[in-house]
C-alpha cells in the first residue's frame, strides 16, 4: 500500500482549510510547472547554509555564551589536564569530523566547543570533504537507483497490464515511488512500454489511489523534455484531459500541471489538447476555488486560445467569459488575476467574445485592478479594456472605471497613459452619461495635460484629442467642457496639432475638436489668435485638391490616406470654419483667405455632408454684405437653387438662408419670386411665410448637430484583425480606436503660410497625399 509520505503528498485535496491547501501546494511535493516557483526561491548559498538573510548572528546569544563559558575559573592543573586530553584525542576528533562512520560506537571524544550547536574548527575544515563524500555517495546511490529501476521496469510494466486490479494498484504505487528519484525517473521515461502502461492504467482505473499514483508519475516525468515526449507519444494527452473530469482534487491537480508543462514545452501538445476536448474541460474547472489550481488552468487556456480563433469560440461556447470575469471579481491572488487577465486579453480581440465579456461585467471587473501594485496586471487589464472599450459604450455602472482612467492619465508610464486615453476615447463616444461623468471627475483638465505632456507622441495625442472631441459636444456638460479646454490652456496645443508632424488621423480628430470648441463663443478669438483659421483653410485646400485630382483621374472610389478619407478632412475643416464664422472677426479672416470660390465649388460635391457644411459656412459669411456679393459673383446662385430641392433638410435650409441673404439688396419683385421659390421647395408639407423662418439656418448644428456631422465619430481601428497583438513578442493588442502611431521617416517642414493663390505651395507642410503605410479603417458605431 501507499506509504505515509505518499498519502501526505497530495492530501491538500482533502484539506478543508483553503489556506493550508495553498501553502501545501507551494511545497515541492507539487511541482508548479513554473508558474509559481519564481516568487519563493532564493539563490543557493555557496556555503551550503541556505538563505544568508536567515543566518543573522544573534549577538545577545553570543554574549550569553561568553558569560556562561567563562563564569567558572579553572586552576592551572585543570587547564593542563584538559590540554592533555585534547592533545591525546586530536586524531580522533579529526577522524570524527571527516569519517564519522569509522568511529567505534559509544566512544566519547571531548569537544573543543562549549556549545554543541556551534561546529568546531576541525568540523568546519572537514565540511568540503564531507560534501565530497556526500557527492560520491549520491553518485553511487544514483547508479544503484538507475540499475534497480532498469531491472524493475520490465516487470512493473507487466504488472501494470495485469488482469488483477490489486496487483495493478500496487504496481502503480511502486512506479510512483520510482518516479520520485531522478535516476529511476529517467529509466521510466526511457521505456515507452512503461509510459504507455502508466497512461493506460490512469485512464482505465476506477481506484482513486491508482489514479493518483499514475497521474503523479506522469507529473514527475513532465519536468523533463524526454518525459514530455514520452507522455505525448504514448497518447498521454487524451488520458490527462479525461482525468480533468476526476472528482479527486489531487488527480485533478496532477493532470492540469502535467498538461500545463506539455502545453509549454511539447510541440504538438496544443493541437492534441484541443482535439481531446481539453478546452471545454478546463473552462468547466474555472468554478474551483483553489487559486493556484485556477492560475494554472487559466494559463493553459491562454496558451490554447492565443492565436487560435477556434479555441476562442470554444471557450465562448463553454461559458468562459463569464467564469473568467467572475475570477477577476472574486480573487486577490496576483498570479491568478494576471493569468486570467491574459486570457481575457486574448479573448478581447475576438469579435464574438468581446460582447460576451462586456455583458458579463468584464469592464467593471477589470477596472477593479487598475490601481493594483502589480504593473503587469494593470497593463494587461488596460490592454484588455482598450480592446473591449468600443463594445462597451452602452454599459451601465462605469463611474468607478472612468474615474480611475482619468487618474491614470497622470501616470508616468507611457503605456498606461496611452491605454487610458484610448479607453476614455471609446467610452465617451455616443454615451452622454460617460461624458458627463468624465467631465465631473476632472477629465478635461487631465486630457489637456496629457496632450501637453505627450508632445508629438500620436499614440497618446490622438485618443486624447478624440476623447476631448467627444466630451465637447452633445451632453449637458459640453459647454463647460468647451470652456475648460481654454481655461486649462489647451487651445495653443490643440491648434499646434493641426501642423506637422501630425498625421491625418490626428489632424482629423483635432479638426473635429476645434469645430466643437468653436461652439463656445469665448473660444472664437483665442482660436483665431492661435492661427487656427489659416491652417484649417490650408488643410481644406490640400484635401480638396487631393479629391479633385482623384476624380479627374477617373477614380470613383474614395481613397484612404493613413486611414483617413480626404473627403472627411474637407467636411471637417469646412464644418469647423462654419462654426468659427459665427464670429464677425473670424468671418473677415476666412473671407480674406480667398475661400469663397472654394466653398462655392464644394456646393457641387456629390457628398451631402460636404454640401451642408459648405452651404452652412456660406450662410454665415453671407451675413456681411461684401461677402454676400462675393458669393453671388462666384456663381453660387445656380448650385444653391439646385440644393433647395435636396432631400437633406439641412442642405436645403442652409441653401435657402444663403439665397435669402444674397437677396437683401435686390428689388422687391426678385425677393417675391425668391420667397415663392423658397416656400415651395422648403415647406412642401407645411407652407408658412418665409420671413417667419428667416433665422432658421443660423442655429442648425449648434444644438448638437442633428444633421449628420459626427462629432462623436469613433473611427475605431482594430489592429488585431490582422493578428497584431502578439503576446509573446510583447506587441500587445491595440485598442479599437484610431490611434495613429508616428510613422518614421516622414518629416514635413513648414515655412511661412503661403498665399492661397499658389496652390502648389500648399503641398508643403502637409502630410503626404499618398501613403503606403499601414492603412487604418474607420468604422462608425
Amino acid at each position: 500500500m501507499a506509504t505515509q509520505a505518499d498519502l501526505m503528498e497530495l492530501d491538500m485535496a482533502m484539506e478543508p482549510d483553503r489556506k493550508a491547501a495553498v501553502s501545501h501546494w507551494q511545497q515541492q511535493s507539487y511541482l508548479d510547472s513554473g508558474i509559481h516557483s519564481g516568487a519563493t526561491t532564493t539563490a543557493p548559498s555557496l556555503s551550503g547554509k541556505g538563505n544568508p538573510e536567515e543566518e543573522d548572528v544573534d549577538t545577545s546569544q553570543v554574549l550569553y555564551e561568553w558569560e556562561q563559558g567563562f563564569s567558572q575559573s579553572f586552576t592551572q592543573e585543570q587547564v593542563a589536564d584538559i590540554d592533555g586530553q585534547y592533545a591525546m584525542t586530536r586524531a580522533q576528533r579529526v577522524r570524527a569530523a571527516m569519517f564519522p562512520e569509522t568511529l567505534d560506537e559509544g566512544m566519547q571524544i571531548p569537544s573543543t566547543q562549549f556549545d554543541a550547536a556551534h561546529p568546531t574548527n576541525v568540523q568546519r575544515l572537514a565540511e568540503p570533504s564531507q560534501m565530497l563524500k556526500h557527492a560520491v555517495v549520491n553518485l553511487i546511490n544514483y547508479q544503484d537507483d538507475a540499475e534497480l529501476a532498469t531491472r524493475a521496469i520490465p516487470e512493473l510494466t507487466k504488472l501494470l497490464n495485469d488482469e488483477d486490479q490489486v496487483v495493478v494498484n500496487k504496481a502503480a504505487v511502486m512506479v510512483h515511488q520510482l518516479s520520485k528519484k531522478e535516476a529511476s525517473r529517467h529509466a521510466i521515461m526511457r521505456s515507452p512500454q512503461m509510459v504507455s502502461a502508466i497512461v493506460r492504467t490512469m485512464q482505465n482505473t476506477n481506484d482513486v489511489e491508482t489514479a493518483r499514483c499514475t497521474a503523479g508519475t506522469l507529473h514527475n516525468l513532465s519536468h523533463h523534455r524526454e518525459g514530455l515526449l514520452a507522455i505525448f507519444k504514448s497518447g498521454g494527452i487524451p488520458a490527462l484531459v479525461k482525468m480533468l473530469g476526476s472528482p479527486v482534487d489531487s488527480v485533478l491537480f496532477y493532470a492540469i500541471t502535467t498538461l500545463h508543462n506539455l502545453l509549454l514545452h511539447q510541440e504538438g501538445a496544443k493541437m492534441a489538447v484541443r482535439l481531446a476536448g481539453g478546452l471545454q474541460k478546463m473552462v468547466a474547472l474555472l468554478n474551483k476555488t483553489n487559486v493556484k489550481f485556477l492560475a494554472i488552468t487559466t494559463d493553459c487556456l491562454q496558451i490554447l486560445a492565443y492565436g487560435n480563433q477556434e479555441s476562442k469560440l470554444i471557450i465562448l461556447a463553454s461559458g468562459g467569459p463569464q467564469a473568467l470575469v467572475n475570477i477577476m471579481r472574486t480573487y486577490t491572488y496576483e498570479k491568478l488575476l494576471w493569468t486570467t487577465s491574459r486570457v481575457l486579453k486574448v479573448l478581447s480581440v475576438c469579435s464574438s467574445n468581446k460582447p460576451a465579456i462586456v455583458e458579463a461585467g468584464g469592464m467593471q471587473a477589470l477596472g477593479l485592478h487598475l490601481t493594483d501594485p502589480s504593473q503587469r496586471l494593470v497593463q494587461n487589464c488596460l490592454w484588455t479594456l482598450r480592446n473591449l472599450s468600443d463594445a462597451a459604450t452602452k454599459q451601465e455602472g462605469m463611474e468607478g472605471l472612468l474615474g480611475t482612467l482619468v487618474q491614470l492619465l497622470g501616470s508616468d508610464d507611457i503605456n498606461v497613459v496611452t491605454c487610458a486615453a484610448g479607453i476614455l476615447s471609446n467610452l465617451t463616444c455616443n454615451n452622454y452619461k460617460n461624458k458627463m461623468m468624465v467631465c465631473q471627475v476632472g477629465g478635461i483638465e487631465a486630457l489637456v495635460r496629457t496632450v501637453l505632456r505627450a508632445g508629438d507622441r500620436e499614440d497618446i495625442t490622438e485618443p486624447a484629442i478624440c476623447a476631448l472631441r467627444h466630451l465637447t459636444s452633445r451632453h449637458q456638460e459640453a459647454e463647460m467642457a468647451q470652456n475648460a479646454v481654454r481655461l486649462h490652456y489647451g487651445l495653443p496645443v490643440v491648434v499646434k496639432l493641426l501642423h506637422p508632424p501630425s498625421h491625418w488621423p490626428l489632424i482629423k480628430a483635432t479638426v473635429g475638436l476645434i469645430r466643437n470648441l468653436a461652439l463656445c463663443p469665448a473660444n472664437h478669438a483665442p482660436l483665431r489668435e492661435q492661427g487656427a483659421i489659416p491652417r484649417l483653410v490650408q488643410l481644406l485646400v490640400r484635401a480638396h485638391q487631393d479629391t479633385q485630382r482623384r476624380t479627374s483621374m477617373g477614380g470613383t472610389q474614395q481613397q484612404f490616406v493613413e486611414g483617413v478619407r480626404m473627403e472627411e478632412i474637407v467636411e471637417g475643416c469646412t464644418g469647423a470654419l462654419h462654426i468659427l464664422a459665427r464670429d464677425v472677426h473670424n468671418r473677415i479672416v476666412i473671407r480674406g483667405l480667398n475661400t469663397i470660390p472654394l466653398f462655392v465649388q464644394l456646393l457641387y460635391s456629390p457628398i451631402e455632408n460636404i454640401q451642408r457644411v459648405a452651404a452652412g459656412v456660406l450662410c454665415e459669411l453671407a451675413q456681411d454684405k461684401e461677402a454676400a456679393e462675393a458669393i453671388e459673383a462666384e456663381g453660387a446662385t445656380a448650385p444653391l437653387t439646385e440644393l433647395l430641392h435636396s432631400r437633406n433638410e439641412g442642405v436645403a435650409t442652409y441653401a435657402a438662408a444663403v439665397l435669402f441673404r444674397m437677396s437683401e439688396d435686390k428689388p422687391q419683385d426678385y425677393k417675391k419670386r425668391l420667397s415663392v421659390e423658397l416656400t415651395s421647395s422648403l415647406f412642401r408639407t407645411e407652407p408658412m411665410a418665409w420671413n417667419e423662418t428667416a433665422d432658421l439656418g443660423l442655429d442648425i448644428g449648434a444644438q448638437g448637430e442633428p444633421l449628420g456631422y459626427r462629432q462623436d465619430d469613433p473611427s475605431y481601428r482594430s489592429f488585431h484583425s490582422g493578428g497584431y497583438g502578439q503576446d509573446a513578442l510583447g506587441m500587445d493588442p491595440m485598442m479599437e480606436h484610431e490611434m495613429g502611431g508616428h510613422h518614421p521617416g516622414a518629416d514635413y517642414p513648414v515655412d511661412g503660410l503661403p498665399d492661397l493663390g499658389h496652390a502648389q505651395d500648399l503641398m508643403d507642410g502637409l502630410p503626404p497625399g499618398d501613403s503606403n503605410q499601414l492603412a487604418w479603417f474607420d468604422t462608425d458605431l
Epitope: 500500500m1 534497480l148 531491472r151 516487470e155 512493473l156 496487483v167 500496487k170
Partner: nanobody, 118 residues
C-alpha cells in the same frame, strides 16, 4: 527462491464445492499479493481472485459471490473456497505469488485440475 505448493482440486458435480490451498515457502517479502488464476486447454490464463498482505480481496466478475479467497500471513498460505460450481469452472487452477519488490518477483504453483461435471 520461493516455492508454491498447491493442494485440493478434483472432480465435483455442478452446484458442488471445492477448496484449493497454496502454501508458499522461501524468502517472501511482506508487500505481496497472492492469487488464483485458471487456464483451460488452448486458452489464455485468466484471473480468478487475489488477496493482498493486508487482506484486500479482488474477484473476477464471473466468480464473484461464489468463490471466497482467504490467507494466513503467518503460514504464508492462501485458500480458495469454491461454491456453486458450474461446468464452465472446469480448468487447471494456478496459485500465484506476486512480491512487490524492486524488481517485482512472480512465482507460480504447479497447477491443480478442477473438473465440474455431472
Amino acid at each position: 527462491q520461493v516455492q508454491l505448493v498447491q493442494s485440493g482440486g478434483g472432480l465435483v458435480q455442478p452446484g458442488g464445492s471445492l477448496r484449493l490451498s497454496c502454501a508458499a515457502s522461501g524468502s517472501i517479502s511482506s508487500n505481496n499479493v497472492m492469487g488464483w488464476y485458471r487456464q483451460g486447454p488452448g486458452k489464455q490464463r485468466e484471473f480468478v481472485a487475489s488477496i493482498t498482505d493486508s487482506d484486500l480481496a479482488n474477484y473476477a466478475a464471473s466468480v464473484k459471490g461464489r468463490f471466497t479467497i482467504s490467507r494466513d500471513n503467518a503460514k504464508n498460505t492462501v485458500n480458495l473456497q469454491m461454491n456453486s460450481l458450474r461446468p464452465e469452472d472446469t480448468d487447471v487452477y494456478y496459485c500465484r505469488l506476486t512480491m512487490m519488490t524492486y524488481p517485482p518477483i512472480i512465482s507460480w504453483g504447479q497447477g491443480t485440475q478442477v473438473t465440474v461435471s455431472s
